[in-house]
């Protein structure tokens, strides 16, 4: 059974993941140039189901494409440093989902834009955090 300290650690990691995802979405929403239009043409796979920490496998598998799209956005007005950001997210995701069980991610049939993708995972984090508090 999870201890109070392990629950607290999980909650903190989820909060950090949530903030990182919110930061990306905010950075993208601030775009008012042709780069945003191009970014929105990239398609991301969405999880068929995302209700448990193990489902973060689906996010992990999309981190590389996410980094590639964010690299497009690099400019003096985009301060997110994709490599550092994605590296940070990757560390959190690996710790949260654990490596004991191998989970095969199932994806929905419809792909999504980067905005829809980020909103989905933000909602996922918020939902799990709510169950922990």
């Amino acid at each position: 059974a999870p201890t109070s300290s392990s629950t607290k650690k999980t909650q903190l990691q989820l909060e950090h993941l949530l903030l990182d995802l919110q930061m990306i979405l905010n950075g993208i929403n601030n775009y008012k140039n042709p780069k945003l239009t191009r970014m929105l043409t990239f398609k991301f796979y969405m999880p068929k189901k995302a209700t448990e920490l193990k489902h973060l496998q689906c996010l992990e598998e999309e981190l590389k494409p996410l980094e590639e799209v964010l690299n497009l956005a690099q400019s003096k007005n985009f301060h997110l440093r994709p490599r550092d950001l994605i590296s940070n997210i990757n560390v959190i995701v690996l710790e949260l989902k654990g490596s004991e069980t191998t989970f095969m991610c199932e994806y929905a049939d419809e792909t999504a834009t980067i905005v829809e993708f980020l909103n989905r995972w933000i909602t996922f984090c918020q939902s799990i955090i709510s169950t922990l508090t």
Partner: antibody, heavy 113, light 107 residues
Framework: QVQLVQSGAEVKKPGASVKVSCKAS????????VHWVRQAPGQGLEWMGI????????SYAQKFQGRVTMTRDTSTSTVYMELSSLRSEDTAVYYC??????WGQGTLVTVSS | DIQMTQSPSSLSASVGDRVTITCRAS??????LAWYQQKPGKAPKLLIY???NLETGVPSRFSGSGSGTDFTLTISSLQPEDFATYYC?????????FGPGTKVDIK
Amino acid sequence: QVQLVQSGAEVKKPGASVKVSCKASGDEFTRYYVHWVRQAPGQGLEWMGIINPSGGYASYAQKFQGRVTMTRDTSTSTVYMELSSLRSEDTAVYYCAAGLFIWGQGTLVTVSS
Amino acid sequence: DIQMTQSPSSLSASVGDRVTITCRASQSIGRWLAWYQQKPGKAPKLLIYSASNLETGVPSRFSGSGSGTDFTLTISSLQPEDFATYYCQQYNRFPVTFGPGTKVDIK
């Protein structure tokens, strides 16, 4: 629990830049993302942006995009907020806040010719 | 951006009164709402987070409720130290946004 101590009041001329510091103590520096919020005299609270102190990357409110830069120095557990091209309407108290629940004491920045 | 509105903008009350302040978001923010108290010359102080969770050390006369777009802060029995300005804040999505504030003064 973390405590935040901010740098002292500043008086700047229009067009200049200001750099406000926010030093953390009492807890792991990288545990909390740091927000910056400002409050003009007699006005409400306005969010400026957020920095991840471990990764050093930041995300800003659109209003300040291009004028604000948030940085950090992990060796001194300090985060910085620099605002450039100052104008009179930037006169405000600038707050740093760890996770939005622990706030610094505020730094008054006055922009006047 | 998510817009936050508060009502009333100010109110006069007496010690012992029950005071209710409402906050509305322009779109659903779930329960990702906080309430702050601010006194002149001081930094804001967190009272309530996640719409209804009382911050450690905050007196139990303060309570919060609501979800989605409509939220309420209630002070069950106003004390002399409660005269201040109260702000709601959403942190469901960035940019974080605050309500314009409600000033509570002595009747």
